[in-house]
Amino acid sequence: APRGTQAEESPFVGNPGNITGARGLTGTLRCQLQVQGEPPEVHWLRDGQILELADSTQTQVPLGEDEQDDWIVVSQLRITSLQLSDTGQYQCLVFLGHQTFVSQPGYVGLEGLPYFLEEPEDRTVAANTPFNLSCQAQGPPEPVDLLWLQDAVPLATAPGHGPQRSLHVPGLNKTSSFSCEAHNAKGVTTSRTATITVLPQQPRNLHLVSRQPTELEVAWTPGLSGIYPLTHCTLQAVLSDDGMGIQAGEPDPPEEPLTSQASVPPHQLRLGSLHPHTPYHIRVACTSSQGPSSWTHWLPVETPEGVPLGPPENISATRNGSQAFVHWQEPRAPLQGTLLGYRLAYQGQDTPEVLMDIGLRQEVTLELQGDGSVSNLTVCVAAYTAAGDGPWSLPVPLEAWRPGQAQPVHQLVKEPSTPAFSWPWW
């Protein structure tokens, strides 16, 4: 740091005083010197370092008519709002000729009520969920002791005896307020009051209860909500791939989710008018008077391909000698998917039922073994998709073909006479 020489007497006739006060105080340091000739610029030092951006003013008063007469120079340094960073040793410095002179030091000190560096913040927390709050204060004078308050009630018997900078709260079941007091020798400062709002916990176990081609029923387990009952839950659904045209180049932006509200209880919702055999994502959040929980993670779900909603139509079954002719038409009801084929079941009196997969044909010829008459033979047909069988038709009795009766219009496919499809009781 610059040092004055002893070769010449110091020009300073007035040195900076001392300032001690609380934060925010406004004060002025002043030094005065008397020089002969052109007045020099006065610099201010704090702890030996030149203050480049000091808020200082310099006044120069000549003591004679001539430039070479003596001058009185006064420099004033203004401290507008005292902060900890302003504290330290202050001196004035001048360059005269080839020499450097510094004044005697003055001291700026800070002393007052504690000052908060960090205060508790408002936040939301899930019910019965641990969290931390922070509070930090400083003097001088030190030490500064903290006392936490919950809903205006102290959490320790005396300042400094309880948690200090960080308060760990194991969980709340109602919305509460927290503040901290900072104590030092000058007195007490109280922080802002933070409101900790208790929201419901995130729902758990979001799952599918049932799936239909255009409908999904979902359920979930609500989380704890403290003393506040849940008012409703909200379900959101989006298309999983949003019908995105990845093949088409630019993918579509994500859609807004469809939002549905569910009364609670029950914690269940039916989502209808969905596209069959389509992937979706769903999530749920539940709300109390204090606000909504966080959302669950997105759950991928898919509407299934459906089974046909009705049986095949216009089934006829006739026998002509050793052959049985069965034919039918496609169900009139929605297929709810891709028709993969038909199943045929036949049964005689006192005989077990036999099932056949006919494929996509709408007729079949069965080769009957033996010459005996068939007793009460009935035939049922069902259509199926990848999702399974649709409803079976009502049993249609096998009728004997009579001369003049029209043969089936379609060419019939003969089933091979294998043991699997033979009727040994004929």
């Epitope: 019908g243 045209g245 469809l258 008018s273 969905l274 596209h275 055999h277």
Partner: antibody
């Protein structure tokens, strides 16, 4: 009963503007993406534009991109198509259409009666 | 964009016959999001098939759809007089949601 009522068609000069409206009733409008489809006289169907359930996402055919703007007002159950810088090639019957399922933008199971837009000098 | 090409452009058949209409996509249609519509003169289109193979409500069972990926077919098993119209396919899996150019089914 689902109803879609198209309005706002008319004769307009090339370079002019027109705004079509589609008033919807009989279903939960805000649960369905909506579309506009047009058909030039004697020609086939051309998909024009679609809008997501909340109105945040809009989709356009290349032929109208930058000139047409689709929008919706869910509080009024109304779909709009603002058409600017109109050309003779935009002459068509414009149909408002609703998909059969929530969230997906098709298939279109209900159609308005159509609004005729004629662009001619 | 996905281009849909329908064939034939015109199909001349008699009532009672079977009609097979084709729709080919330039790229795979995601989720088989393909629909078929029927349009008669002066009327709005009518949805017949969605999801490539599911019949819309109230559509007679003589109409059926099949296919996946890029090749799709609409079949009318036994033509009725009221079936003679223009038929369009549309993909709604990728924006822009394009239509085919149409197949006119006329009485022979």
């Amino acid at each position: 009963e689902v109803q879609l009522l198209d309005s706002g068609g008319g004769l307009v000069q090339p370079g002019g503007s027109l705004r079509l409206s589609c008033a919807a009733s009989g279903f939960t409008f805000s649960s369905y993406a909506m579309s506009w489809v047009r058909q030039a006289p004697g020609k086939g169907l051309e998909w024009v534009s679609a809008i997501s359930i909340g109105g945040g996402n809009a989709y356009y055919a290349d032929s109208v991109k930058g000139r047409f703007t689709i929008s919706r007002d869910n509080s009024k159950n109304t779909l709009y198509l603002q058409m600017n810088s109109l050309r003779a090639a935009d002459t068509a019957v414009y149909y408002c259409a609703k998909p059969g399922f929530i969230l997906v933008r098709g298939p279109l199971d209900y159609w308005g009666q159509g609004a005729l837009v004629t662009v001619s000098s | 964009e996905i281009v849909l090409t329908q064939s034939p452009g015109t199909l001349s058949l008699s009532p009672g016959e079977r009609a097979t209409l084709s729709c080919r996509a330039s790229q795979s249609v995601s989720n088989s999001y393909l629909a078929w519509y029927q349009q008669k003169p002066g009327q709005a289109p009518r949805l017949l098939i969605y999801g490539a193979s599911s019949r819309a409500t109230g559509i007679p069972d003589r109409f059926s759809g099949s296919g996946s990926g890029t090749d799709f077919t609409l079949t009318i098993s036994r033509l009725e007089p009221e079936d003679f119209a223009v038929y369009y396919c549309q993909q709604y899996g990728s924006s822009p949601y394009t239509f085919g150019q149409g197949t006119k089914l006329e009485i022979k």
